[in-house]
Interface confidence: low
């Protein structure tokens, strides 16, 4: 289920899957929510630790049992991912942090009159992930009112420093507030060039696009279909970026599909989950559990309820069925995507709906029926 | 509308004109007013133009040539395109427009009632399509709102006429076997309405078709009843009251 409570002065021991710098616990929790394996997190505010390297440290954690031992640590904040928390799931983070400089690659500097304007500039710049703004009272006069637009390889700051009269924050693109607008077209038989930032396996281009949308550095993608001429590249989703923010070239290429991240859409973003079930497809991965259930939809529900499950395969092979129930293979991987996609199998595959923000959520709202 | 006739004031008070203002201003699609602040239209109207600030929505009008720079229009607060709509396919061709400011209802500007969820049992025999679209395939936008009475066609019959396309249960077709009367380019997004028990209901949203008014090529419409859950979800306000006209 959905666990929203935060644990003050507590730190989860072990289970680390990733670490980064974040300005507060809420942002750390959001990163945990969107990380494929993170179930728990611990955050170290600047006041909680003398070690400069670990200040603002956000530690993402996994656990086979779903929990880890808590140790006392003054100032630390720990909690759970919001996977399975329905419409509390959002990549939107509006907070502005005073007295904090979030470090990264500074690629644009301009003079603006307020931190809000700086945040707006970041939101309206295709490559900007976060920003820092030197206020009117910043100690060096030549830097006053400077708005620095930034990015980093992981989308989070490479360091966070306490610095007076500096204010920092994140792009509001995930809040669907970008003025850029987005290309919703999917381009059949077209391959994009430029820099690959990641490679995952997906069953179709729409899953590829959603993954691109929620990847911090993906601006566009190319997907190689299951009939692509090179067998080892079939179902490969290449997440891409470029200096300009758009593909520098596109090549007509049969059995490829390309498109853009939808992060710059002005309306709501696509849900960070994939609800479609793929008949005749087997998703390979690390086995989490095998259970007998009645029907593929129940298999998907079972995967969704088991928080560590990322995807599933429901087998219809006679040897995998007992009366009306068949084997439901609950699986996971390092990146949340299948490690192998096989076609022509007797069964169906799909993804957990744990990140669907339309999911059932009794924590924060009471549903009312329409008259 | 091919084979139609002029409408009169207040005859179709839910009909709106979706226009784009770039250098010039032109009518691109129709739409239906379903609440003080909501318009239902086709998703494909926004293909290539998803920028809400270029759109102007004219309601309570009959003649496009009456529109001047002083004619009031609504602007878009939000465009909600169905999450499963794809430009390359005809499925889920439905979009909601939230207006920046609510409209007052008058005799010339009021909403159309929506069907009940999954309405499959009602047999509609009096159905009309309206719009300012082309009056022939290679035609032009019409000044006066046109109307045409068209019978619904079963999905099985429609599928026979469109072998290359999947006619899903979430589509509804309308047309004459001999052709001659149909929606056409520029009518997209507008209403297919049917009168039943004295009440007009929005049965379809003008979506696509092979040419216009061709023999044995009916028009294909998005079946509104199949999207009631989606419409209610997207239009529900924070106090839980649906902000649109649903049947009593």
């Amino acid at each position: 289920g959905c666990l929203t409570q935060l644990y003050e002065n507590a730190f989860f021991r072990g289970g680390d899957v990733a670490s980064m710098y974040t300005p507060n616990a809420q942002y750390c929790q959001m990163r945990c929510t969107f990380h494929p394996r993170c179930l728990l997190f611990s955050f170290l505010p600047a006041s909680s630790i003398n070690d400069m390297e670990k200040r603002f440290g956000c530690f993402l954690k996994d656990s086979v049992t779903g929990t880890l031992p808590k140790v006392h640590r003054t100032g630390a904040v720990s909690g759970h991912s919001l996977k399975q928390c329905g419409h509390q799931i959002s990549a939107c983070h509006r907070d502005i942090y005073k007295g904090v400089d979030m470090r990264g690659v500074n690629f644009n500097v301009s003079k603006v009159s307020s931190v809000e304007e700086c945040q707006k500039r970041c939101t309206s710049n295709i490559r900007c992930q976060f920003f820092s703004y030197a206020t009117q009272t910043f100690h060096k006069a030549e830097y006053r009112n400077n708005c620095l637009l930034k990015y980093s390889p992981g989308g989070t700051p490479t360091a966070i420093k306490v610095l007076s009269n500096v204010e920092s924050g994140f792009s509001l693109k995930p809040c669907a507030l970008s003025e850029i607008g987005c290309h919703m077209n999917i381009f059949q038989h077209l391959a994009f060039s430029d820099v690959d930032v990641a490679r995952v396996l997906t069953p179709d281009a729409f899953v590829c696009r959603t993954i691109c949308t929620y990847h911090p550095n993906c601006l566009f993608f190319t997907f190689y279909t299951n009939v692509w001429k090179i067998e080892s590249q079939r179902n490969v989703c290449l997440l891409k970026t470029s200096e300009s923010g758009t593909p520098s070239s596109s090549t007509p290429q049969e059995n490829t599909i390309s498109g853009y991240s939808l992060l710059t859409c002005k309306r709501t973003l696509p849900e960070p989950c994939h609800s479609k079930i793929y008949p005749g497809v087997d998703f390979g991965g690390e086995e989490l559990n095998v259970t007998f259930v009645k029907g593929v939809n129940v298999c998907q529900e079972t995967c969704t309820k088991m928080i560590r499950c990322q995807f599933f395969t429901y087998s219809l092979l006679p040897e995998d069925c007992k009366e009306e129930k068949c084997k439901c293979f609950l699986r996971l991987s390092m990146d949340g995507s299948p490690t192998r996609i096989a076609y022509g199998t007797q069964g169906s595959s799909g993804y957990s709906l744990r990140l669907c923000n339309t999911g059932d959520n009794s924590v924060c709202t009471t549903k009312t029926s329409t008259r | 509308i091919v084979g139609g006739t002029n409408s009169s004031w207040g005859e179709w008070p839910w009909q709106v004109s979706l226009q784009v203002k770039l250098t010039a201003q032109r009518h691109l699609c129709g739409g239906s007013l379903i609440g003080h602040q909501w318009v239902l239209t086709a998703a494909h109207c926004f293909d290539g133009l998803p920028l809400q600030d270029v759109w102007r929505i004219y309601s309570g009008i009959l003649n496009l040539s009456d529109i001047t720079k002083d004619t009031p229009f609504s602007q878009i607060k939000e465009i909600i395109i169905h999450q499963n709509y794809k430009v390359s396919e005809g499925n889920h061709d439905i979009a909601l427009i939230k207006l920046q400011a609510p409209l007052n209802y008058t005799e010339f500007q009021k909403p159309i009632c929506l069907p009940s969820k999954g309405d499959t049992s009602t047999i509609y025999t009096n159905c009309w399509v309206t719009g300012w679209g082309f009056s022939k395939e290679k035609g032009e936008i019409q000044n006066i709102l046109q109307k045409v009475n068209i019978p619904l066609v079963t999905n099985e019959e429609c599928q026979k006429r469109y072998q290359d396309y999947k006619i899903t249960q979430r589509m509804v077709c309308a047309g004459y076997k001999e052709g001659g009367k149909d929606a056409c380019k520029g009518d997209s997004g507008g209403p297919l309405v049917c009168k039943h028990n004295g009440m007009w209901r929005l049965v379809g949203i003008t979506s696509w078709g092979e040419g216009c008014a061709r023999r044995e090529q009916p028009g294909v419409y998005t079946k509104v009843a199949e999207y009631m859950d989606w419409i209610l979800e997207k239009t529900q306000s924070s106090d839980g009251k649906a902000q649109m006209q649903s049947p009593a």
Partner: antibody
Framework: EVQLLESGGGLVQPGGSLRLSCAAS????????MMWVRQAPGKGLEWVSG????????VYADSVKGRFTISRDNSKNTLYLQMNSLRAEDTAVYYC???????????????WGQGTMVTVSS | DIQMTQSPSTLSASVGDRVTITCRAS??????LAWYQQKPGKAPNLLIY???TLESGVPSRFSGSGSGTEFTLTISSLQPDDFATYYC????????FGQGTKVEIK
């Protein structure tokens, strides 16, 4: 009525450059994929380049890739073809055309301009 | 790339004749094929799209058939206005034209 009017053709030396324009009217230019198609004297039709409605995606025939650049200005309803490093074999009448997208798939070029002649010769 | 091969390259016929032009694709293009007519000094004119659908305003003596890799354009009764060059064009994967068939007076 749909109209496409090409201009900018003429005589140019090998290695030179030309910029062709196509002014469109009578349809919603910003919604359409636009194309350039050429026809060498006494020869058949050859697709040269295409640009998607937003202008973000461009595609080229292998014979012109790296030398020609297609672009559009939706606010001016105009399509362009910047031709660099011209060769004798680029001599042709250049047509602009458009196709409808969406459903049903009407991807044939259903409207053409009258063409503009480009001659590459020393 | 998909290649389109038209045959014959030239066809001599008389008014009233039934004329057939064939077009072969190097791989399956489903029904995504168009036929054009072009007269000297003029732009091409779309006759048929989706292999068999007649463009609005085109006389019914023109018809198209085929799918996959084999397609034909038929003129049931050749008229004086029909002497021209005809091109097929695939649009399954981008766009490729056939080399053309010139229909001339016998």
């Amino acid at each position: 009525e749909v109209q496409l009017l090409e201009s900018g053709g003429g005589l140019v030396q090998p290695g030179g450059s030309l910029r062709l324009s196509c002014a469109a009217s009578g349809f919603t230019f910003s919604h359409y994929i636009m194309m350039w198609v050429r026809q060498a004297p006494g020869k058949g039709l050859e697709w040269v380049s295409g640009i998607y409605s937003s202008g973000g995606i461009t595609v080229y025939a292998d014979s012109v890739k790296g030398r020609f650049t297609i672009s559009r200005d939706n606010s001016k309803n105009t399509l362009y073809l910047q031709m660099n490093s011209l060769r004798a074999e680029d001599t042709a009448v250049y047509y602009c055309a458009y196709r409808r997208t969406g459903i049903p798939r009407r991807d044939a070029f259903d409207s053409w301009g009258q063409g503009t002649m480009v001659t590459v010769s020393s | 790339d998909i290649q389109m091969t038209q045959s014959p390259s030239t066809l001599s016929a008389s008014v009233g004749d039934r004329v057939t032009i064939t077009c072969r694709a190097s791989q399956s293009i489903s029904s995504w094929l168009a036929w054009y007519q072009q007269k000297p000094g003029k732009a091409p004119n779309l006759l048929i799209y989706k292999a068999s659908t007649l463009e609005s305003g085109v006389p019914s003596r023109f018809s198209g058939s085929g799918s996959g890799t084999e397609f034909t354009l038929t003129i049931s009764s050749l008229q004086p206005d029909d002497f021209a060059t005809y091109y097929c064009q695939q649009y399954n994967t981008y766009w490729t034209f056939g080399q053309g068939t010139k229909v001339e007076i016998k």
